[in-house]
């Protein structure tokens, strides 16, 4: 309610502050680490539902710009008009920088040199050069000539003939030309084919015409084509006239306008054994694997959540020639993820596409913290302009003009915290009184306390004190005046759910608004004057108990309801004949009791069946929930369950199901919370599996429209989400799905960045959540290159990512030692000016001279490197010394292991972390 003003924060509320409006916090947009500024020369695509923000750029795109364009393939062979780049819209990014910058010639990091022949194309490192071109001025529909195998002339062209779409690491001469089709849109825009630039040994050739001749057959190498229109067709390479002994490696590179994704539909596919097709989404921080040949069945639709995609076809040399396929792609408008629903609140979305908005509101008793409205902004990956808000229960507050509403303790329905003192002042409108319903009061059995005072301050007389009263008054409380003063205090130990109170103001001569927990009511008059009748009903799964279904406001002098309001309770057992409904464990959402034996019968029309959607199942290991496929306990058991279990579904083969629940008489069920929630639906009896729902933050791709036996449905998640459960569900022979429905869960952590050789790492948390850090420190003798500290960052449009890649610890490089001169009357080996760290030099003396000192000395690695010993000298030997063989031609050093061979050298002052 807008009149509710909370006291912010928890802890001691020293007084009551009155506030206007709601407590809100300035939104903090999530910062994106997408540093890439997308560059394109493409026109705005005029597609359905396109954001109006882009419209103003369309006309501009059709006016020429004085820039020398790179030649592109014309739509008509005799067309004299070259394509010109079109200007770009400036769209807001998370950090308020433009997402799309001014045009520059290339779209996708085009290398300056043409690709080499040998290097395989790697979409992660360098996509092929791609030029997206503007359309011609509007005119009649035009189509790209399609090259068919039968159209090929028999003449042999010069040795450097090129297919117009040849790009990347392709072989110099291609033995056949692929079929390339591009469908015309309403604007006359074609999926244009990029210019080819190929480099021979000495020259560079640029071609802008379709070559319909073929070269003398050469072994086919890798092949690639670019597609840049809003839609087009991808076809397998045509069969060569002579079988090749070299396989194929073909790449189809698709790029549509940023802000759009690429949707690829499999029209036809027939591959030979050993052939592979992979589909990847490009244009994001990392290539995104989307599908491979095992999933690419006819009718399958693959969606890349980025504006670029690549299809790679690899074939071994096959006697029968390569397999065939025919795919169709089209651009589709990307959308923001579905905003997170706040706990104790809700969200309504006008559209997930750019320009759409999400409106948040909180359940009664909770205040919204954050932005009430979010807008989806256009970008390469659209994003919300602010973080989703949260709904919080405030500790105290003043509620002026209180009509109907609710106050809840902080943390409700979870536990409250310790050492709280919360005061609420409820003030009804002038000349009205208040009624309080006790929705829930659950206090820890210690010094936690709830006092309700009949007045507007702490001195007013109490009408309810949890210290004094064991049971809650069913009829609630009435104020004698305009005010109630509510005090809620907790001590330093223990906690429980706290309290939820519902208040209603009523005028003189009227009754207060009734309330039924887990139910609803209809009234014959809106303000409940004397004579009003109210009829109660319960929420699905609940039954009316204690009290009457219909009550009346009576007594003109002191209006009051003639009977107490009824209660809605989840009861043990029942017979249900509705086409849809709910079965709840006894006393839900409170814990069920021990020693219960409950039976529910659910019956639908004879020619129908029942789907049981078990949404919550949290029972003890000694408790049993059994489903019987029929109308009594002798029927076939559909399933029997004990202990907690995740969401699952069951399908009956009959029009009746019997549900039995037996709780263990010996143990307390309290440890298992609630119990179970079973939704049931009447479903048609037919030869298809039941329709599968869409999942939040993801989409589904059925292999065919009818969900007949054998149909495969693949679920995929939007960027930043991952599939939890099985992503592939198959319609089984019994017309049930092979797996439970998966969900798309927000990826909240980074992958383990791994250990780095010759280092140790310090981690701030084990599972690498957003904000976690990993610090690498090299072992001694090694130098760190890269970032020593990595931080896991959240990203609006994708999974969390490390701030950098893991570093490397490289062996320290040492400077060489300067050469020593040979001793007088001696020699050194080797004779060099510089000696690398770890090297050894050997000294020898001329005949008649004796070596004094070390015969071999070593260049010891260090900063600086230094010789292990001083150089020796050669002294003249005495005659008897000479004849005794004490002077050697070459003095041999004792064998020592080279420090360089085995040691990892390092000095600690030269580390860079």
């Amino acid at each position: 309610l807008s009149s509710e003003a909370p006291i912010t924060g928890e802890g001691q509320a020293t007084g009551i502050r009155e506030m206007d409006g709601e407590l809100t916090a300035a939104p903090t947009p999530e910062q994106s680490d997408r540093g890439v500024h997308f560059v394109t020369t493409a026109p705005t695509l005029k597609l359905l539902n396109h954001h109006p923000l882009l419209e103003e750029f369309l006309q501009e795109g059709l006016e020429g710009r004085e820039e020398a364009p790179r030649p592109a393939l014309p739509f008509q062979p005799d067309s004299p008009t070259p394509f010109t780049p079109s200007p770009l819209p400036r769209l807001t990014n998370q950090d308020n920088r433009p997402v799309f910058t001014s045009p520059t010639p290339a779209v996708a990091a085009a290398p300056t040199q043409p690709h080499s022949r040998k290097k395989p194309w790697n979409p992660e490192s360098e996509p092929p050069e791609l030029y997206i071109t503007s359309p011609l001025p509007p005119g009649p529909s035009m189509a790209v000539p399609t090259l068919h195998p039968e159209d090929r002339p028999s003449t042999t062209p010069p040795s450097q003939a090129w297919t117009p779409t040849q790009e990347g690491p392709g072989d110099m001469g291609r033995p056949w030309v692929p079929e390339i089709m591009s469908k015309t849109t309403g604007l006359g825009i074609e999926g244009t084919i990029a210019t080819s630039t190929a480099s021979g040994d000495d020259e560079e050739t640029t071609t802008t015409t379709i070559i319909t001749t073929v070269t003398t057959i050469q072994p086919p190498g890798p092949c690639s084509w670019n597609f840049s229109g809003p839609e087009g067709s991808l076809d397998s390479p045509a069969v060569p006239s002579v079988p090749s002994d070299v396989g194929l490696d073909c790449l189809y590179y698709i790029s549509v306008y940023p802000g759009y994704g690429v949707e690829i539909k499999v029209k036809n596919i027939s591959l030979q054994e050993g052939e592979t097709i992979t589909v990847e989404g490009l244009g994001g921080p990392d290539p995104l694997p989307l599908a491979n040949q095992s999933f690419l069945l006819r009718g399958q639709v693959i969606r890349s959540p980025t504006h670029q995609a690549a299809v790679r076809f690899q074939s071994l040399p096959l006697p029968a020639g390569p397999g065939t396929f025919h795919f169709h792609y089209q651009a589709y408008l990307l959308s923001c993820h579905f905003p997170r629903r706040p706990a104790y609140g809700d969200v309504t979305v006008t559209s997930l596409h750019p320009g759409g908005s999400a409106r948040f509101h909180c359940a009664t008793g909770y205040q919204l913290k954050g932005a009430r409205f979010l807008t989806c902004l256009n970008a390469t990956q659209p994003f919300w302009d602010s973080q989703e808000p949260v709904c919080i229960a405030a500790c105290g507050g003043v509620i002026r003009n209180a009509t109907t509403g609710r106050i809840v303790s902080p943390g409700f329905p979870g536990n409250y915290s310790n050492n709280l003192t919360c005061h609420w002042l409820l003030e009804a409108p002038e000349s009205q009184r208040l009624h309080l319903h006790f929705e829930k009061v659950s206090l820890a059995e210690d010094d936690d306390r709830l006092i309700i005072r009949n007045g507007n301050n702490v001195e007013a007389p109490p009408v309810y004190d949890s210290y004094e009263v064991e049971y809650l008054p069913i009829e609630g409380l009435l104020s004698s005046g305009r005010h109630f003063f509510v005090e809620f205090s907790t001590d330093s130990s223990g906690a429980a759910a706290g309290m939820a109170l519902r208040y209603e103001a009523f005028q003189q001569g009227h009754c207060y608004e009734p309330f039924v927990k887990y139910g609803n009511f209809s009234s014959s008059a809106p303000s409940y004057p004397v004579g009003t009748t109210v009829e109660f009903s319960c929420d699905p799964g609940y039954t009316l108990e204690q009290g009457s279904i219909i009550i009346e406001c009576v007594d003109l002098r002191d209006p009051q309801w003639n009977e107490t309001e009824p209660a809605c309770r989840a009861v043990c057992s029942g017979e249900i004949t509705d086409s849809a409904g709910v079965v709840l464990s006894p006393n839900w959402p409170e814990p069920y009791g021990r020693g219960q034996d409950c039976i529910w019968g659910v019956h639908v029309e004879e020619d129908k069946r029942i789907m049981l959607d078990i949404r919550v199942l949290r029972i003890g290991s000694g408790d049993v929930l059994t489903f019987y496929d029929g109308d009594d306990l002798t029927a076939r058991v559909l399933g029997q369950y004990s202990g907690p279990r995740g969401h699952f579904k069951l399908f009956t083969s009959m029009a009746d199901v019997t549900i039995q629940f037996q709780s263990d008489p010996g143990t307390s069920a309290l440890g298992y919370q609630q119990g179970f929630v079973i939704h049931f639906f009447e479903v048609p009896r037919n030869d298809t599996c039941p329709e599968l729902p869409e999942i939040p933050n993801g989409w589904k791709n059925p292999s065919q429209p009818e969900l007949v036996h054998g149909t495969v449905v693949t679920y995929q998640c939007y960027p930043g989400y991952q599939v939890v459960g099985s992503s592939i569900l198959m319609c089984q022979w019994d017309l049930s799905w092979s797996e439970d429905l998966p969900s798309c869960q927000r990826v909240t952590s980074c992958h383990d960045p791994g250990d780095v050789e010759h280092s140790r790492r310090l981690i701030s948390s084990l599972k690498f959540p957003v904000g976690a850090t990993v610090q690498y420190i090299c072992d001694q003798g090694f130098v760190l290159t890269g970032s020593a500290i990595l931080t896991c960052h959240d990203r609006q449009a994708g999974s969390p990512k490390w701030s950098d890649r893991a570093p490397k610890c490289l062996l320290e490089q040492f400077k060489p030692c300067h050469g020593l001169s040979a001793p007088e009357n001696g020699a050194r080996s080797p004779e060099k000016r510089l000696h690398p760290a770890g090297a050894t030099i050997h000294f020898s003396c001329a005949p008649g001279y004796v070596l004094k000192g070390q015969a071999s000395i070593k260049c010891v690695p260090g900063h600086p490197s230094h010789w292990s010993d001083p150089p020796p000298i050669c002294r003249a030997a005495s005659l008897d010394g000479f004849y005794n063989g004490r002077s050697l031609d070459v003095a041999k050093a004792p064998a020592t292991s080279s420090a360089l061979d085995a040691a990892h050298h390092h000095h600690h002052h030269h580390h860079h972390h």
């Epitope: 010759h758 310090l762 990993v774 003798g781 500290i789 040691a903 600690h908 030269h910």
Partner: antibody, heavy 120, light 106 residues
Amino acid sequence: EVQLQQSGPEVMKPGASVKMSCKASGYTFTDYNMHWVKQNQGKSLEWIGEINPNIGGTGYNQKFKGKATLTVHKSSSTAYMELRSLTSEDSAVYYCARTYSYYSYEFAYWGQGTLVTVSA
Amino acid sequence: QIVLTQSPAIMSASPGEKVTMTCSASSSVSYMHWYQQKSGTSPKRWIYDTSKLPSGVPARFSGSGSGTSYSLTISSMEAEDAATYYCQQWSSTPPTFGAGTKLELK
């Protein structure tokens, strides 16, 4: 002057946990990692692990993973080590230590040690 | 992990005598560090990066070696040098220490 002041001796029962402290002074606590070293009665030294007080990152000797937990309290410039599930094998002197510079690999500054005795 | 073996485990020397103790590594290491520890006190950094002496360590101490073989030498033993000496490497994580050489005064 760099000083590392460790908490006093502890006598513990098997199965219990012990938490010792190491208060640093004479330098900026968050600028250097804090290391912990065990010296048992046989006098050999073993590196347990280290913590970066700035980011809270920890690294452990595989042998002490699950046995030791390192934490810091930045505002008081104090490092802590908790040892759990104590056995007689854990009876030893435990030192906190700091390297000379951020990029050095030898322990230049040592605490006076905390003697832990585990006995039934 | 790299194992450091110190020898001898115990040795004694007279004042003025030259003393050499060794530390052998199970794999090649780039540097060796040495610590002196006297009974009831914490270890002290005595030699670092194979051959460097921190301030306060007498010049009669020296260190040398490379690869898997390192040594600490006292050119002329003095009474105050009686202690246990430990070698330590960190060329591979985890850092490891030798079992120590106890030097006694004869």
